[in-house]
């Protein structure tokens, strides 16, 4: 679809003559008839197949024709066509004299032909005017012409339709050849695919307008390259969507089992020692003078047997005092009025005089202690066994009976059960005081992750296009890890054909 445009510039008929040799009376009041048709080697009568047009009276005898863009007598003349421009044409321009109406002379009776010209040739579509001048014995016509495409038509033959748009069906302008030129932010054959935010992950992200980056399920962040942990996860992270990889000190399927209760909750009071013992489990080892599950209870002041030499202890609100037996005195009945002559040393202890007979000192045999060697040695009073070990008196010495997971003279060494890598199939090992605990990866169970779960969600092969299936955090949940070029929770659609976006 296009327009053949003819610009009439000058007509000369200086003698004011008609084609039949007669003069015009009083002068040749001239209008033009134009006939445009398909190319003919010999111009013949018949319909003007490409269009025809007439002008009003443009002047008398000889005159210059100015451009006029509106109203009657528009110049250049417009001959629109709604087909593919063939590149060739035949054009007949006739000059006529009318005695009648200036504006619609072609309807007047008594019109007479002044002259005519016929042009046959080729003409390419373009903005440039082709100029020509035709002379015959009586007249001269100067004119120019061109073919241009109608609005929204492009190409060598005005056959390519392109209408610029900026809506849901496309966002483009038109190039001179009719090809689409996408507006900024859009791409695709019809400029209907938005260009996402730079760096937006091409599988995990998508957009419905330019510079957006919306994440597909399971992904987050500005570029959709960070995974989202499982819905039920409490203290864990992920490396693939819906995973729950436990933070340090947490275990269990949803990382909700506290493996480090001591650090997270500090349950042991009054300076006691806390030892973890399994999920949410712990033991408090109290300092002397305290008791209770959390060492929160203070023992009686007399509980430490502060009175020596058989003195009896009496508790007061914030203190105590010792009632001493005959022959002893002092805050703790530690001083004696006896001498070696009174044979004060028991259990074979030997007596030594001090201070010119005013006092004495007992040297006790092994396993006995006290001012008078009256006490059997308890080598466990100093709580020498660490990590909840049990202290046992063994004659002149003592031994520590350690809890599982500990060793050493004082149970001070931790045995790492995990050093033996007891967890199968990539299970994560946690050293607990009553033995190792394995947190199993998806698809495995058992104390050592040795049992393969076969009835999981991956058994049905739910992932498409060669994707790898991982079972999630419950037997009927799964995650598909898509190969390059595919997306979706089951890798069911290719990246090149994203799901259509609702508008």
């Amino acid at each position: 679809s296009g327009i053949f445009q003819l610009r009439l510039q000058e007509f000369a008929n200086e003698r004011g003559m008609l084609a039949n040799g007669r003069p015009c009376e009083p002068g040749c009041r001239t209008f033009f008839r134009i006939c445009l048709k398909h190319y003919q080697a010999t111009f013949s009568e018949g319909p003007c197949t490409f269009g025809n047009v007439s002008t009003p009276v443009l002047g008398t005898n000889s005159f210059v024709i100015r451009d006029k863009n509106s109203g009657s007598g528009r110049n250049p003349l417009q001959l629109p066509f709604n087909f593919t421009w063939p590149g060739t044409f035949s054009l007949n321009i006739q000059a006529w004299h009318t005695p009648g109406d200036d504006l619609r002379p072609e309807t007047s009776p008594g019109n007479s032909l002044i002259s005519q010209i016929i042009i046959q040739g080729s003409l390419a579509v373009g903005k440039n005017w082709k100029s020509d001048e035709q002379n015959n014995t009586l007249t001269r016509l100067r004119y120019s012409y061109r073919v241009v495409c109608s609005d929204n038509y492009y190409g060598d033959s005005c056959s390519r339709l392109c209408k610029k748009r900026d809506d849901h069906f496309g966002h483009y302008e038109c190039q001179p050849d009719g090809s689409l030129s996408c507006l900024p932010g859009w791409t695709g054959k019809y400029c209907d695919q938005p260009i996402c935010l730079s760096g937006c992950h091409e599988q995990n992200g998508y957009c419905s307008k330019p510079d957006e980056c919306n994440c597909r399920p399971g992904w987050q962040g500005p570029l959709c390259n960070e995974c989202i942990p499982h819905n039920g996860c409490r203290h864990g992270t992920c490396t693939i969507p819906w995973q729950c990889a436990c933070d340090e000190g947490w275990g269990g399927l949803f990382c909700d089992q506290d493996l480090n209760y001591c650090t997270h909750h500090s349950p042991c009071k009054n300076g006691s020692t806390c030892s973890n013992s399994g999920p949410r489990g712990y033991t408090c080892t109290c300092l002397p003078g305290y008791t209770g599950e959390h060492c929160e209870l203070e023992l009686s002041k007399c509980a430490s047997n502060p009175c020596r030499n058989g003195g009896s202890c009496k508790d007061h609100e914030n203190s105590y005092h010792c009632l001493c037996p005959p022959g002893y005195y002092g805050q703790h009945c530690e001083h004696s009025t006896l001498t070696c002559a009174d044979s004060p040393c028991f259990n074979g202890g030997s007596c030594r005089e001090r201070n010119q007979g005013a006092s004495y000192a007992c040297e006790c045999p092994p396993n006995f202690t006290g001012s008078n060697c009256e006490k059997k040695v308890d080598r466990c009073t100093s709580n020498p066994c660490a990590n909840g070990g049990q202290c046992l008196n063994r004659g002149p010495s003592r031994t520590c009976r350690c809890r599982p997971g500990f060793t050493g003279t004082h149970c001070e060494l931790h045995i790492s059960d995990c050093a033996r890598s007891p967890c199968a199939h990539g299970g994560t090992c946690h050293d607990l005081e009553n033995g190792p605990v394995c947190t199993c990866p998806a698809g495995f169970s058992g104390r050592r992750c040795e049992v393969r779960i076969t009835n999981d969600a991956c058994a049905s092969g739910p992932c498409f296009n060669g994707a790898t299936c991982y079972t999630g955090l419950s037997p009927n949940n799964f995650v598909c890890n898509c190969p390059y070029g595919f997306v979706g929770s089951r890798c069911e659609f290719p990246v090149g054909l994203p799901p259509s976006f609702p508008w």
């Epitope: 919306n214 987050q220 962040g221 960070e226 819905n231 039920g232 933070d247 929770s489 799901p499 976006f501």
Partner: antibody, heavy 118, light 107 residues
Amino acid sequence: EVQLVESGGGLVQPGGSLRLSCAASGFTFGNFPMSWVRQAPGKGLEWVASISSSDSWATIGDSVKGRFTISRDNAKNSLYLQMNSLRAEDTAVYYCARGYYNSPFAFWGQGTLVTVSS
Amino acid sequence: DIQMTQSPSSLSASVGDRVTITCRASQEIYRNLAWYQQKPGKSPKLLIFDTSVLADGVPSRFSGSGSGTDSTLTISSLQPEDFATYYCQQYTYYPPTFGQGTKLEIK
């Protein structure tokens, strides 16, 4: 136990501002994306905004874009919603929820009522 | 935006009944669908995600199914505590959208 506790709601005039807070406990807050969802009286649920876990990338719903902003402070285990240029149609119970705009909302707070009225 | 249409909008049933609520999306949502339960004056509670996966602590009488655009929530034997409003939600496309809700009442 996961707990989300919203605060900051109340009565505000049209054009006014309000800042909602959500205190989280019972999970490692910094590991999870968070969202705000609202519910107008007697109506259904409407997603308002989401924020990613680590880099605090905010995504805001069209109905409140340019007026509301979502933010978080992982050190304080807190989520916030700054609401400016409030309109009558923003009247709703606002819920803090654990989840992103492309995931289920696994845990919800008890909600805080925002009333916009002159 | 994706439109989520629940049916019915309200439903009367008795304890022990089997109840089905459906949710239709305006286009394919690839199983990325959740169901929530909300009791009056309370916040919503996640029941089911990924169309059929039961959330932690949810009784097994609740189940979900569906594919493409249609999803279903089924309660196999209604208990007194199940009378509430139920919402579906899609999370395939931005923005996430909810159904208008189905109110389940005692007959």
